[in-house]
């Protein structure tokens, strides 16, 4: 039979989250127990302030901090505890919208779900063993802290605070599912799920890094492509006090302070887009893998799932090369992305190219990670665009894209696909933050020659834009592959930062599908009105906001 329902254990009575909620986690010195209290307390292990402005701006804002007087493990667990505590209603609604039936009671693919559960259990067990064997390793210390944070999140949500001192278990089909949403796209294929989340050709983000004339600024922009059910959004600011290793003698990590776009119950970005206190901005677009022969590299032992490697690299790295070195260890071959690491420390405003270090590109597929410094390319062409197709020829070929080009044509090619051409045509028009926002949320598919799909009826296709609006494709159209169909999917946000904004850990951000030159998305008027979208606004007409950290 089907697996029992996982995830949120307690039914939420009041689903209307308050406008603001502030909580702290205190350590009772006598009993050694952790407890949650309202407000911010000076001796708290961790604290968080959640401001819910989803109805006003499309975003909630989470400001979370931990206290360096306590050991890293306690901080990490408490960080998870306090995040769940201030955002429990949003977590419940996001879970219901996106994951409630994943391997749940109505799941028909029991065989796949058993394989997934087994894969995750073996992988979690293998990581626990590595953590025990490598207790002094900065890498495994950070892996442990990441899993402790997730454990705190889950324990807090379920109403029990029990700080684990030794080994601890993570439920494979609990809130781990919210973290591995990206990894699942590939795990489903590697484990032979028959109906997968991934549509052939489905894009998963657009990004551009733009050097303004005279190097007067370097702008970084990202547009997440996702199912519209994922539009309960939180911009998070973490101010942690973790050390590189488990002893106090270790220095603090480089990436303790970070701001990122995220989702309820998710302790990393997932989009991905991070502004780090180390001076790095890290972001990705998904390239996936279309070569079935590579799935043999996806194994539960010897690999760390991508979401964890992402967190660890963000925490430990001070530059792009180190970030890549950390990230590529224990390649899981899941959530296969093109990562862009921008190091603002190396960028000289109004100055010449430093020759290296400003931009590092990494591409991962199963069994392969390729890295290169692309600073000179950035300064020569003035931009780096990313649109779900591998740049490196070796990755492009190994991941099976040549076959798709042969079958479907330029849509799958690196230089000739619609977004590549739109970016190339319009990137020179970016002159400031506002024009960058317009480019990264651009979709004028009815009027743009580059949005035409010759094999489609009708020819204009809303997928063929920088920010897709696949809900606007006609349901009764004729399309060569799934990505071009009508579906509740598209670009669901915009994040843009600059040299000066990144210094202040800030960004411009807009939530929801683009409506610059298109009708705004409205659940009640859409063909997808019956889909769960608890807690979401009905009408999505939000303008970009400057993220309001105090």
């Amino acid at each position: 039979g089907a697996l029992p329902t996982q995830g949120p254990g307690r039914r939420r009575q009041n689903l209307d989250p308050p406008v603001s909620r502030v909580r702290s986690v205190l350590l009772d010195a006598a009993s050694g127990q952790l407890r949650l209290v309202d407000g911010i307390h000076p001796y708290a292990v961790a604290w968080a302030n959640l401001t819910n402005a989803i109805r006003e701006t499309g975003w909630a804002y989470l400001d979370l901090g931990t206290n360096g007087s306590y050991n890293d493990s306690l901080q990490a667990y408490a960080a998870g505890v306090v995040e769940a505590s201030v955002s429990e209603e949003l977590i419940y609604m996001h879970w219901m919208n996106t994951m409630v039936n994943y391997c749940g009671p109505f799941e028909y693919e029991v065989g796949y779900c058993e394989k997934l559960k087994s894969f995750l259990e073996i992988n979690l067990e293998w990581m626990q063993r590595e953590m025990e064997l490598s207790q002094d390793s900065p890498y495994w210390h950070q892996v442990r802290l990441t899993l402790l944070q997730l454990k705190g999140l889950e324990d807090s949500y379920e109403g029990r605070l029990t700080f684990p001192t030794g080994r601890f278990t993570i439920k494979p089909l609990g809130f781990l599912l919210l973290q591995i949403a990206g990894d699942l796209e590939d795990l489903e294929q590697a484990l032979n799920k028959t109906s997968t989340k991934l549509s052939l050709g489905s894009g998963s983000c657009s990004a551009i890094i733009k050097l303004l004339p005279g190097a007067r600024d370097l702008l970084v922009a990202h547009n997440t492509w996702n199912s519209y059910q994922n539009m309960l959004r939180i911009i998070k600011k973490y101010q942690l006090q973790f050390r590189q290793g488990p002893q106090e003698a270790y220095p603090l990590i480089a990436g303790n302070n970070l701001v990122f776009s995220s989702y309820p119950g998710t302790i990393f970005s997932g989009d991905d887009f991070y502004i780090l206190g180390s001076g790095l901005v890290t972001l990705e677009t998904t390239i996936g893998n279309k070569n079935p022969a590579l799935w043999k590299y996806v194994q539960p032992q010897g690999c760390v799932l991508e979401w964890i490697r992402n967190i660890v690299a963000n925490r430990l790295a001070l530059d792009g090369a180190t970030w890549a070195d950390i990230f590529k260890q224990f390649n899981s071959g899941t959530y296969n992305n093109q990562w862009m690491i921008v190091d603002y420390k190396a960028f000289i405003p109004n100055g010449p190219s430093p020759g290296s270090r400003v931009l590092t590109i990494l591409e991962q597929i199963p069994g392969m990670v390729v890295v290169a410094d692309k600073t000179e390319d950035l300064y020569k062409t003035t931009y780096w665009a990313s649109y779900n197709i591998p740049f490196f020829e070796i990755v492009f070929n190994a991941s099976g894209l040549q076959d798709l080009v042969a079958q479907y044509g330029d849509w799958f090619s690196y230089t000739k696909n619609p977004r590549a051409q739109i970016f190339q045509r319009d990137q020179s028009l970016v002159e400031d933050m506002n024009s960058m926002v317009r480019l990264i949320r651009y979709n004028n598919f009815l009027h743009d020659p580059l949005s035409l799909c010759e094999a489609c009826i009708p020819k204009p296709n809303a997928e063929n834009a920088i920010s897709a609006r696949s809900d606007l494709n006609p349901a009764n159209g004729s399309y060569p592959f799934q990505a071009l169909y009508q579906r509740p999917h598209g670009g669901i946000d915009v994040k843009v930062t600059s040299f000066s904004l990144a210094k202040r850990m800030s960004m411009l951000a807009a939530s929801g599908p683009t409506w610059d030159q298109l009708p705004p998305f409205q659940w009640s008027l859409s063909p997808f009105r019956s889909m769960l979208h608890m807690g979401q606004p009905d009408l999505w007409t939000f303008s970009p906001i400057s993220v309001p950290w105090d």
Partner: antibody, heavy 119, light 107 residues
């Protein structure tokens, strides 16, 4: 500096076809979107349609059955043809550029040509 | 089509005064609005793009504000050369449409 210059007749009889030319210098019509806009005697401005850098066209639905916009890239010119004109088509006709859909404003305009429809 | 309504039709001012032109859209258009000035016998000239963004070469006395459905163009100290017609234009959806214009005249 981008410059646009309209040319064509000042007077057309009702039911005839209006033909106007826009000559572009300082930019190529193989980039951007090249528009026709008219201003009626009561000062109302109306966007009539455009031809894109690729040659695709869009026409205001209110004119769709009567309008055609074409181009000659070798001359860097584009053209407006409006069939079956009536006195209601009396207006000043402007050609104007939109650089891209990232910049959705008319940044360069011709000086305009005034057309009277009268028998 | 999106209807753009400008008010008032005519504004009479003295030099040095601050003046504001209003433009209302029939539905929310975010900040997809642009303002033009047309002097007598001239062609329209772009003054403000995307509701509030300035244009190089346009005097700093011109400014714009608003989002959604209500927008304002302001001149903080009118000069005689500002006597002209002022138009708003939406670019949220085709066909792009203009307001009926406001005529600025000297008292």
């Amino acid at each position: 500096e981008v410059q646009l210059q309209e040319s064509g007749p000042c007077l057309v009889k009702p039911s005839q076809t209006l033909s106007l030319t826009c000559s572009v210098t300082g930019d190529s019509i193989t980039s951007g979107y090249w528009n026709w806009i008219r201003k009626f005697p009561g000062n109302k401005l109306e966007s009539m349609g455009y031809i894109s850098y690729s040659g695709s066209t869009y026409y205001n639905p209110s004119l769709k059955s009567r309008i055609s916009i074409t181009r000659d890239t070798s001359k860097n010119q584009y053209y407006l043809q409006l069939n079956s004109v009536t006195t209601e088509d009396t207006a000043t006709y402007y050609c104007a550029r939109i650089a891209s859909w990232i910049t959705t404003y008319f940044d360069y305009w011709g000086q305009g040509t005034t057309l009277t429809v009268s028998s | 089509d999106i209807v753009m309504t400008q008010s008032p039709a005519i504004l009479s001012v003295s030099p040095g005064e601050r003046v504001s032109f209003s433009c209302r859209a029939s539905q929310s258009i975010g900040t997809s609005i642009h303002w033009y000035q047309q002097r007598r016998n001239g062609s329209p000239r772009l003054l403000i793009k995307y509701a509030s963004e300035s244009i190089s070469g346009i005097p700093s006395r011109f400014s714009g504000s608003g989002s959604g459905t209500d927008f304002i163009l302001s001149i903080n100290s009118v000069e005689s050369e500002d006597i002209a017609d002022y138009y708003c234009q939406q670019s949220n959806s085709w066909p792009y449409t203009f307001g009926g214009g406001t005529k600025l005249e000297l008292k």
